[in-house]
């Protein structure tokens, strides 16, 4: 088991500021937007735009807000109860299975295939074989036709931040 982390171990911006709002824990837990004090007697509010908590918790400090990477746009800012929501810029996408970075959408389909789905922040363009209608799952094709795609308009946010 790891040693207990104390407030002194935390970065200065994570330490409880004396002016932060306090309330009492309920059944040993603090509500979203708060963390518990080291002595367990108080719930201390998170700092807007700096940290957050989304659920009832017994965290010694709130979780740090995510900063959107370059290549991402901020859909909604970090609040005390919700992390930042970031989304890939137009023309790029992030797959659930490889969420580390936004990848460029392909500009067209391989020869013999037609585009049936646009580039969205969470998926590449979708290509199917002209004849069979089966999907193409390969990487960027060596030869592309002149079938081009314009970046899709996002219908809903794609967030890794929960």
């Amino acid at each position: 088991e790891s040693a207990l982390i104390t407030q002194q171990d935390l970065a200065p911006q994570q330490r409880a500021a004396p002016q932060q709002k306090r309330s009492s824990p309920s059944e040993g837990l603090c509500p979203p937007g708060h963390h518990i004090s080291e002595d367990g007697r108080d719930c201390i509010s998170c700092k807007y735009g700096q940290d957050y908590s989304t659920h009832w918790n017994d965290l010694l400090f709130c979780l740090r807000c995510t900063r959107c990477d370059s290549g991402e746009v901020e859909l909604s800012p970090c609040t005390t109860t919700r992390n930042t929501v970031c989304q890939c810029e137009e023309g790029t996408f992030r797959e659930e299975d490889s969420p580390e970075m936004c990848r460029k959408c392909r500009t067209g389909c391989p020869r013999g295939m037609v585009k049936v789905g646009d580039c969205t922040p969470w998926s590449d363009i979708e290509c199917v074989h002209k004849e069979s209608g089966t999907k193409h799952s390969g990487e960027v094709p060596a030869v592309e036709e002149t079938v081009t795609s314009s970046p899709g308009t996002p219908a809903s946010p794609c967030s890794l931040s929960g």
Epitope: N57, L60, P99, S161, G162
Partner: nanobody
Framework: EVQLLESGGGEVQPGGSLRLSCAAS????????VGWFRQAPGKEREFVCA????????YYAESVKGRFTCSRDNAKNTLYLQMSSLRAEDTAVYYC???????????????????WGQGTLVTVKP
């Protein structure tokens, strides 16, 4: 390969207690947050609790607040869920899960988790 194996489920009366365990066969267990989810018949899988990698601090769903406690033993690569004051609505298959990537401090949504156990059934009935 990540393997998660839950145990400790069973039938219990309302007001009773159970302790679930989840054994992980992955070397990175001690550096990753880990969570419990549950799925009742005909319902979607829902978040129960998640605990930080070092075992200090956890998130809890409002429905289990004050009744369930999430803990872990990194030396044994094991996650625990202590359940007390059980109710009929706690009847479900309980799953432990590891996130699909390691940089989310305390993920609490199904889509953020990529590795799942096979589940253990908890039935609460008189």
């Amino acid at each position: 390969e990540v393997q998660l194996l839950e145990s400790g489920g069973g039938e219990v009366q309302p007001g009773g207690s159970l302790r679930l365990s989840c054994a992980a066969s992955v070397s990175t267990f001690g550096t990753s947050p880990v969570g419990w989810f549950r799925q009742a018949p005909g319902k979607e899988r829902e978040f129960v609790c998640a605990i930080r990698w070092e075992g200090v601090g956890a998130y809890y769903a409002e429905s289990v607040k004050g009744r369930f406690t999430c803990s872990r033993d990194n030396a044994k690569n094991t996650l625990y869920l202590q359940m007390s004051s059980l109710r009929a609505e706690d009847t479900a298959v309980y799953y432990c899960a590891l996130p699909r990537r390691g940089d989310s401090e305390l993920p609490s949504t199904v889509k953020e988790y990529g590795y799942w156990g096979q589940g253990t059934l908890v039935t609460v009935k008189p």
